[in-house]
């Protein structure tokens, strides 16, 4: 539970943080999980111990493994494991999956890309920003902070960016990179008022008597996630539960589908043991959303039975 | 129509509409209002059947429709009555596949006047 995956490139700085928190007060020891031997707490060292970070400067394919680190107080001691892997820098564009930090969305109205894990370094202002490897030019393109904005965020924005930074420790300087995949959502969503697709207005549906039958009532509502949206049967002009036919019976539950994009519901009317009472009502499929409310209905005929050749 | 009438600011009255000549269910109805120069709005609307509703915007919270299947009458209940809510307020209705504000509505009250003073 108290285990952090921290990845890195040799010859880049490297620094982790104890997934045991504490208060700042409070000392924190390092370990080589393997040997169980302590890791200096001096600058001097390229890897060393400073408070809840361990920092690898620079890293080297060598130190992979896992690392122990003990939040020690007055009262009790919290051990955490850091399990650290050092890759070999690539000699192609390409960033492997196992290299890649969170993949984040934007939008249109929201394009905020953090650089991750930079609050762990001493780093100075500018970012420089990469996209496939090329660097970002052009006005659409900011670096603010420790984040890069993207004016009018389009489709194709899409991919991994990385973000280099120079980490400064005691006047020496270490160079960091890292990426983390960028997809676009599409919030042109849009609500209209419903539209039915089954049944059509005023279908007569052949059932056989005796036989079970079901009707679909389905609707549509519009692009993306839709907010008071609803599909549902009437018999007569009242709802299932108050008619009191018992063979006559709203599926639970509402089948929500993706249609080309559009957001569509459907319930199905489960009628059992059809009698001929049942050809004299009106059922009436229902959509409603926030725009209104629309109504298709439906009449049942008899299934002439299929004549048998002797 | 019927429950219109003079309200000051704050105020409450209810507005019923009873239907003759046709089965109360799978209607949609509504009320409307129309204050003087302005254009006809639709301020509630209703789905007798299964009690759907639908508000304006500047009616949510105050102002509740009703159905009394029984006695086949519509209502609403206004409350927080505010000058601006003063018009002349129809009942409609419509048979037709559609529900809601707006809609066209086939059948339509003479009206009763609402005037709210502050």
């Known amino acids: 539970k108290f285990s952090k995956q921290s990845w890195g490139l040799e010859n880049e700085a490297l620094i982790v943080r104890c997934p045991r928190q504490g208060k700042p007060s409070y000392t924190v020891d390092w370990y080589y999980s393997q040997t169980n031997k302590s890791i200096p707490t001096q600058e001097r060292n390229r890897v060393f111990a400073s408070g809840q970070l361990l920092k690898f400067l620079p890293a080297a394919v060598a130190d992979s493994g896992i690392y122990t680190c003990i939040v020690r107080s007055p009262t009790f001691n919290r051990t955490g494991y850091a399990n650290v892997t050092i890759y070999k820098k690539q000699s192609d564009c390409n960033v492997p999956d196992y290299l890649m930090y969170s993949t984040v969305s934007g939008s249109e109205k929201n394009s905020k890309i953090y650089c991750p894990t930079i609050d762990l370094y001493n780093w100075t202002a500018p970012l420089e920003w990469f996209k496939n490897c090329q660097a970002l030019q052009g006005s659409r393109y900011r670096a603010h902070k420790s984040f890069l904005v993207i004016d009018n965020v389009m489709t194709e924005d899409a991919g991994d960016y990385t973000c280099k930074f120079i980490h400064n420790e005691n006047g020496a300087n270490y160079s960091v990179t890292a990426t983390r995949s960028f997809t676009v959502k599409d919030e042109q969503g849009f609500s209209l008022f419903p539209v039915i697709g089954a049944p059509a207005q005023n279908e007569i549906k052949e059932v056989e008597i005796g036989k079970n039958a079901n009707l679909t009532c389905s609707a549509c509502f519009g692009k993306g996630t839709q907010f008071l949206a609803a599909v549902l049967w009437q018999l007569n002009g009242t709802k299932i539960t108050d008619f009191g036919e018992p063979r006559i019976q709203q599926e639970e539950g509402q089948n929500q589908s993706f249609s080309n994009g559009l957001a569509c519901l459907d319930m199905v009317l489960r009628i059992a043991d059809v009698k001929e009472e049942d050809l004299l009502l009106q059922y009436d499929c229902l959509a409603l959303n926030l725009h209104g409310l629309r109504r298709h209905t439906v009449r049942l005929s008899r299934k002439n039975p299929s004549k048998e050749c002797f | 129509e019927s429950g219109g009438g003079s309200v000051q600011s704050g105020g409450s009255l209810r507005l019923s509409c009873a239907a003759s000549?046709?089965?109360?269910?799978?209607?949609?109805m509504g009320w409307f209002r129309q204050a003087p120069g302005k254009e006809r709005e639709g301020v509630a609307v209703l789905y007798t059947g299964v009690d759907i509703t639908y508000y304006a915007d500047s009616v949510k919270g105050r102002f509740t429709i009703s159905q009394d299947n029984a006695k086949k009458t519509l209502y609403l209940q206004m409350n927080s009555l505010k000058p601006e809510d003063t018009a002349l307020y129809y009942c409609?209705?419509?048979?037709?596949?559609?529900?809601?504000?707006?809609?066209?509505?086939?059948?339509w009250g003479q009206g009763t006047q609402v005037t709210v003073s502050s």
């Open positions: 000549g046709y089965t109360f269910r799978r209607y949609c």
């Open positions: 409609a209705a419509d048979s037709g596949p559609l529900c809601g504000l707006g809609i066209q509505f086939g059948y």
